[in-house]
């Protein structure tokens, strides 16, 4: 069961896996959740008797999922969120005052303030956390010095009380890094650099995901099952280098190499290994053996067994045992199989319990039918219809769900809108006719318009709606991923514009959500078509040379959604254009990637 509550002055006895240092109990709980085996923890607060144990976070495991409770002053105990259904994030924007988080200092430089120091850490490949000496620090020579730090585990090796310094963590896991995101996997390539760890993996994609959530892995080499040396088959070597890039590439068949997706992990699944591996057996410590009907049932069983990390399903040989087989639930110290065997007929895979550690926007949506302009239920689950109720209720604009309390839309939608009270947001809608008096909607608490917005044509045509209540995600109502800063060089080829807007310039709002596949254009190309306008880097253009497919009145604020590596990204917001679907007049969209900092600043504000 899911226990969120923390137990003050309680120590969980026994079950110790390892001890790390965290600035508070809440952070200790997150560290426990992301650790492959931790189910419970005890954190030693400053009020504990032994000052040498302050800030220690003791990660624990138990076969019974519980441990004896002992009274102890200053101890705070609790359970990991592994048992909980809600989405998780490793993002920690807190700044810890008067704490020196210790690790390996590898860079010391002067910065204006702690925020700049945190940015420096976020944009440095090696940095896990930082300590900044404020301008009130007693040692004058050390004032304003920003120390970037890393450790083998990503957590501090110690924490000291120290007045007039502040510490904090890298915001890479908050999607705030400017570092490049290199998604290519290079076949027949070995990176010859420092191995920091090695794990067993079934393929290069799982190897890459493991590299992504390893604190120090910057790139990897994976040896496939065809690799000549048997002891290296299915071996995933996690690597780093001082420069952050591989120093040497060696051409070797049956090896694949690639990079950590740390800098784009919010828009790509890195914890969720959902595939099945056929004719493959995963070896590890056996947790349980159960009879089930099929490998999918075996995966479900592993997902519901809290300590299960991976499984192998073996179908029964007896013909009378139709469809039944044996499900071997397994675990290991690092969450990966200890060995992988092929040719034995097993079907293996991983628990799906870790999928909630990925951004919900990365989960696959229902397969779509290509062609046709009317959308299908659940095809664009991030699309919302924004209504105004004054003077009468009508569709005003489109919008996109980007968080459980946030809609991203266009600023120009709010011309003449005096108050958020007259707005209603409807999610999970296909036909406008579904909206009746009693249809559930979200009230709008706040309209946040970019403060540089003047007109759609001059740019900054972007706005956020903060909902009055949080949204529960369903198959027909869930978020779209924002693009990654690190993805700025990606060429999107599968882009769609959606909305209930006019189908021609003089028309009316459509009942059914319409969709159109539209190619993106370069800004140079676009400038040629709009010579009397300034097409800025904050805009992106899409459309056919011959016209015919475009967004139109009523589509404003809606998404330009592009699919890349099986994940949909909100690349643009429908903004403006000359006419609709005119020849040589592409549609102009707000270029979302250029406004990521603004979006994150507004949505992650305390």
């Amino acid at each position: 069961e899911c226990v969120i509550k923390l137990f003050s002055d309680i120590y969980f006895q026994g079950g110790d896996i390892t001890t790390v240092y965290t600035p508070n109990a809440k952070h200790c709980q997150v560290v426990c959740t992301y650790h492959p085996r931790c189910l419970l923890f005890t954190f030693m607060a400053e009020s504990s008797v032994d000052s040498t144990k302050w800030f220690s976070c003791i990660l624990k495991d138990s076969v019974t999922e519980s441990l004896p409770k002992v009274n102890m002053t200053g101890a705070i105990s609790g359970y990991s969120f592994k048992q909980c259904p809600h989405q998780l994030s490793a993002c920690n924007k807190d700044i810890y005052v008067d704490l020196d988080m210790q690790g390996m200092n590898y860079n010391g430089s002067v910065t204006k303030n702690a925020q700049e120091c945190q940015e420096r850490c976020t944009n440095d490949a090696h940095c896990h956390f930082f300590t900044y000496a404020t301008r009130q620090f007693p040692s004058a020579e050390h004032r304003n010095i920003c120390l970037l730090k890393y450790t083998q585990t990503g957590a501090p090796t110690g924490i000291r009380k120290l007045k007039k310094v502040v510490s904090g963590f890298s915001l890479k896991s908050c999607a705030l890094s400017n570092l490049a995101c290199i998604r290519d996997i290079f076949p027949s390539t070995v990176f010859a650099d420092n191995n920091i760890d090695s794990v067993v993996a079934p393929d290069a994609l799982v190897c890459r995901r493991i590299c992504t959530h390893h604190p120090n892995c910057l790139f990897f080499t994976f040896f496939s099952q065809e690799w000549p040396k048997e002891s290296h088959r299915n071996l995933c070597l996690l690597k780093t280098s001082e420069s952050g890039l591989p120093s040497t590439r060696i051409h070797k068949n049956q090896a694949l190499s690639g990079f950590s997706l740390q800098n784009c992990r919010h828009s790509i699944p890195v914890f969720c290994h959902s595939s099945f591996y056929y004719d493959t057996d995963f070896l590890g410590e056996e947790l349980d053996i159960v009879d089930v009907k099929g490998h999918e049932a075996c995966q479900k069983m592993c997902t519901s067994a809290i300590r299960c990390q991976f499984f192998t399903y073996s179908s029964s040989q007896e013909s009378h045992n139709k469809g039944k087989g044996t499900c071997y639930l397994k675990l290991s110290s690092n969450g990966s199989p200890t060995k992988i065997l092929h040719g034995r007929g097993g079907i293996s895979g991983y628990t799906l319990r870790l999928c909630k550690m990925d951004n919900v926007c990365t989960t696959k949506i229902k397969p779509r039918i290509v062609g046709g302009s009317a959308s299908l239920p659940g095809e664009w689950p991030w699309q919302v219809t924004l209504h105004t109720v004054s003077p009468t209720q009508r569709h005003l604009c489109g919008g996109s769900i980007i968080g459980n309390q946030w809609i991203l839309t266009a600023a120009h939608c709010f011309y003449g809108i005096e108050s958020p009270k007259i707005l209603r947001v409807y999610g999970g809608i296909l036909n406008q006719s579904e909206i009746k008096e009693d249809t559930a909607f979200f009230g709008v608490q706040e309209i946040i318009i970019h403060d540089q917005y003047k007109t759609a044509e001059s740019g900054y045509d972007i706005a956020l709606l903060k909902l009055e209540t949080t949204m529960n995600y369903t198959d027909s109502q869930r978020p779209i991923c924002l693009p990654s800063k690190g993805d700025r060089n990606v060429i999107y080829t599968d882009c769609w514009v959606t909305g209930w807007g006019y189908r021609k310039l003089r028309d009316k709002i459509q009942n059914t959500l319409q969709k159109a596949k539209i190619p993106l254009l370069s800004n140079e190309e676009c400038r040629k078509r709009y010579q009397r306008h300034e097409i800025t880097s904050g805009m992106i253009c899409a459309g056919y040379k011959e016209g015919g497919k475009d967004a139109c009145k009523g589509d404003s604020g809606g998404p330009l959604s592009c699919k890349h590596n099986e994940v949909w990204h909100l690349v643009g917001i429908t903004s403006w254009g000359e006419g609709c679907a005119q020849r040589e007049r592409p549609g102009i969209y707000t270029n979302v990637v250029k406004y990521l900092d603004w979006i994150l600043e507004k949505t992650q504000a305390p």
Epitope: Y106, S109, F137, P138, S139, L148
Partner: antibody
Framework: QVQLEESGPGLVAPSQSLSITCTVS????????IYWVRQPPGKGLEWLGM???????DYNSALKSRLSISKDNSKSQVFLKMNSLQTDDTARYYC??????????WGQGTTLTVSS | DIVMTQSHKFMSTSVGDRVSITCKAS??????VAWYQQKPGQSPKLLIY???YRNTGVPDRFTGSGSGTDFTFTISSVQAEDLAVYYC?????????FGGGTKLERL
Amino acid sequence: QVQLEESGPGLVAPSQSLSITCTVSGFSLTGYGIYWVRQPPGKGLEWLGMIWGDGRTDYNSALKSRLSISKDNSKSQVFLKMNSLQTDDTARYYCARDYYGSKDYWGQGTTLTVSS
Amino acid sequence: DIVMTQSHKFMSTSVGDRVSITCKASQDVSTAVAWYQQKPGQSPKLLIYLTSYRNTGVPDRFTGSGSGTDFTFTISSVQAEDLAVYYCQQHYKTPYSFGGGTKLERL
């Protein structure tokens, strides 16, 4: 673990130059300042100078004209050079790591004798 | 440059005594003062930094106090292994400087 080790010539003639190397392990010179401190026989500690993580240097005012501190981050080595040595430069020379101006780790020191 | 003065070159004490060593700075050094212990034939060892912060592994009988120009280092109950030379050092502004040292000896 953190270690610092000084190595020097041991004996130098007056008016000659001195070069001492401090080799460190367990941490990176790009993230820590390194100090040089000396101690004449039976006397107290004297602060000579330091090199910061970013390569900036600071020196003892009285010795500034004779001192030079440099480093090689890739080799994890810090160098102390001192010229025009006199007999009163005879001392044990230590390198130490910076922790906000204090010195949290010290080498064992190397003894220098200035004598003809 | 800042001069640090330890007025007592020697201090006599017995096991179990409370002893305080003082150090005076020639100008305001805020709270940027460290204290070191040095035993014969050994390198100095950091005990206290920034006036009152104990270094890792230093017993809590060692404490420091003061600010501005006047600083005190105290051993609440002297142990035999505490007999050594103690140095103060300002780490407020470079060039950093040490006091002359105070030798703690058996009475």
